[in-house]
């Protein structure tokens, strides 16, 4: 069956270059036109570039024209996107997508590869407790959590009590701070009566920096 | 370039409902229109092409129609697997423009948020920064307004919000709003409050604390 396998994404500094690859199998590569489409975090789909099956026709979105170059190697069944002079606004998941026969809609898609354009360097998070108190208690339910702050790049994973606690957990999508670093909160609601007896630990893992933190969250002692 | 305008941006519906999404082109594209479905973290999936031709393997409840500049995608009887984001795409011209997307969400019953506030930890204050977190838990619909007040003065530009995806079990959302200050600024003030407005609340709910007090 048709398969498009992408590689080459990663973190890159503004102004630098990156090359994405899209390796095709399950069809005669040289007969098909393939496009690049991208999706910025939390945004819609944006068409980026196309190269015709014979290489004669290349076309680019205005936003990338003059900076990105599409190419293909039929002997390797691979399509490329060379991205130069990268900007923070180029941060997105990039997809390669194959057309159906000669009609220019996208019947087959790659799995996507994330490109992050940032001047930030890899950094592990600081993990701070969001301690339960009378201000975070409502009708027999208490809320507590962990603030996972100032890390780069995405993602971090958060579990509670090594995965034993899942009910009532909300781990929020990360926000990009003005510093260029990410921050997120993970919270859990528990019975107020359990605060004195049950231990609550958030387990934070940031693989890019090889950082693991286990933070115990307990009521503030006054 | 041909611009594609989709409406609505969000659509709340229940299983079994008939739902319709509209896509308008800024100039005629004949029937050169495709529709895609996308779920979080996944690549888009082709549903429909040439405005009304169903892609192989796509259920017949998906119905496409239209030509020229006006197009619709109808789901005749919404199924649990259909809650996703839908995009139209014109392929009449070189720039294969997409619509901005329509998110089809589960229509829940109104639930007012439970509101909690968290002061910055002593550990964080030692680092020179103070983050105050306001949590809005398990509410529906998604629209909620959070305002920060410090000694009753409205804050702007120094907070960030994040909202969860809709909960698959109870259809609610949760939101965190984080007010970030320097330690020096934090220690200049006493009363920190987040005020929450939501359609399920007859009046705004305010949660607050006095700095330094338990």
């Amino acid at each position: 069956q048709v398969q498009l396998v992408q590689s080459g994404g990663g973190v890159v500094q503004p102004g630098r270059s990156l090359r994405l690859s899209c390796a095709a199998s399950g069809f005669t590569f040289s007969r098909y036109t393939i496009h690049w489409v991208r999706q910025a975090p939390g945004k819609g789909l944006e068409w980026v570039a196309v190269m015709s099956y014979n290489g004669n026709n290349k076309h680019y979105a205005d936003s990338v024209n003059g900076r990105f170059t599409i190419s293909r190697n039929d002997s390797k069944n691979t399509l490329y996107l060379n991205m130069n002079s990268l900007r923070p606004e180029d941060t997105a998941v990039y997809y390669c997508a194959r057309i159906r026969d000669t009609a220019m809609f996208f019947a087959h898609w790659g799995q996507g590869t994330l490109v992050t354009v940032s001047s930030a360097s890899t950094k592990g998070p600081s993990v701070f407790p969001l301690a339960p108190s009378s201000k975070s208690t409502s009708g027999g339910t208490a809320a507590l959590g962990c603030l996972v702050k100032d890390y780069f790049p995405e993602p971090v994973t958060v579990s509670w009590n090594s995965g034993a606690l899942t009910s009532g957990v909300h781990t929020f999508p990360a926000v990009l701070q003005s510093s260029g670093l990410y921050s997120l909160s993970s919270v859990v609601t528990v019975p107020s009566s359990s605060l004195g007896t049950q231990t609550y630990i958030c387990n934070v893992n940031h693989k890019p920096s090889n950082t693991k933190v286990d933070k115990k969250v307990e009521p503030k002692s006054c | 370039d041909i611009q594609m305008t989709q409406s609505p941006s969000t659509l709340s519906a229940s299983v079994g409902d008939r739902v319709t999404i509209t896509c308008r082109a800024s100039q005629s594209i004949n029937t050169w229109l495709a529709w895609y479905q996308q779920k979080p973290g996944k690549a888009p999936k082709l549903l429909m092409y040439k405005a009304s031709s169903l892609e192989s393997g796509v259920p017949s409840r998906f119905i496409g129609s239209g030509s020229g500049t006006e197009f619709t995608l109808t789901i005749s009887s919404l199924q649990p697997d259909d809650f996703a984001t839908y995009y139209c795409q014109q392929y009449n011209s070189d720039s294969k423009m997409f619509g901005q997307g329509t998110k089809v969400e589960v229509k829940g019953t109104v639930a007012a948020p439970s509101v909690f506030i968290f002061p910055p930890s002593d550990e964080q204050l030692k680092s020179g920064t103070a983050s105050v977190v306001c949590l809005l838990n398990n509410f529906y619909p998604r629209e909620a307004k959070v305002q920060w007040k410090v000694d009753n003065a409205l804050q702007s530009g120094n907070s960030q919000e994040s909202v969860t995806e809709q909960d698959s079990k109870d259809s609610t959302y949760s939101l965190s709003s984080t007010l970030t200050l320097s330690k020096a600024d934090y220690e200049k003030h006493k009363v920190y409050a987040c005020e929450v407005t939501h359609q399920g609340l007859s009046s705004p709910v305010t949660k607050s604390f006095n700095r330094g007090e338990c």
């Epitope: - | 629209e143 909620a144 307004k145 407005t197 399920g200 007859s202």
Partner: nanobody, 120 residues
Framework: QVQLQESGGGLVQAGGSLRLSCEAT????????MAWFRQAPGKEREFVAI????????YYSDSAKGRFTISRDNAKNTVYLQMNSLKPEDTAVYYC?????????????WGRGTQVTVSS
């Protein structure tokens, strides 16, 4: 000035129906969400239903869903609450409220309420 005037309340037997109306005067009805709340004796005011300006988006509380229907006539500046299969626990004062933000529940204007009593 803005006034919201509810009507249509009364005494009804369990299983019966009532239709409440709320007429808005002095208010630009366009762009305004209209909601119904209720308050039973000794209890907090609770949300019942809301209808956005377009009229195509409605939301209900758990207790109202399937039995109550909210609608609006923008030409008449009026919002309605059709209440079917009424239960004794629906007994309350019903208030209409206007949310000019159409989204966030900024209920700037309230009616004085109309009493609904459901007898068993």
């Amino acid at each position: 000035q803005v006034q919201l005037q509810e009507s249509g309340g009364g005494l009804v037997q369990a299983g019966g129906s009532l239709r409440l109306s709320c007429e808005a005067t002095g208010l630009t009805f366009s762009g305004v969400a209209m909601a119904w709340f209720r308050q039973a004796p000794g209890k907090e005011r609770e949300f019942v239903a809301i209808i956005r300006w377009s009229g195509s988006t409605t939301y209900y509380s758990d207790s109202a869903k399937g039995r109550f229907t909210i609608s609006r006539d923008n030409a008449k500046n009026t919002v309605y609450l059709q209440m079917n299969s009424l239960k004794p626990e629906d007994t309350a004062v019903y208030y209409c409220a206007a949310d000019p933000s159409d989204r966030f529940g900024e209920y700037d204007y309230w009616g004085r309420g109309t009493q609904v009593t459901v007898s068993s």
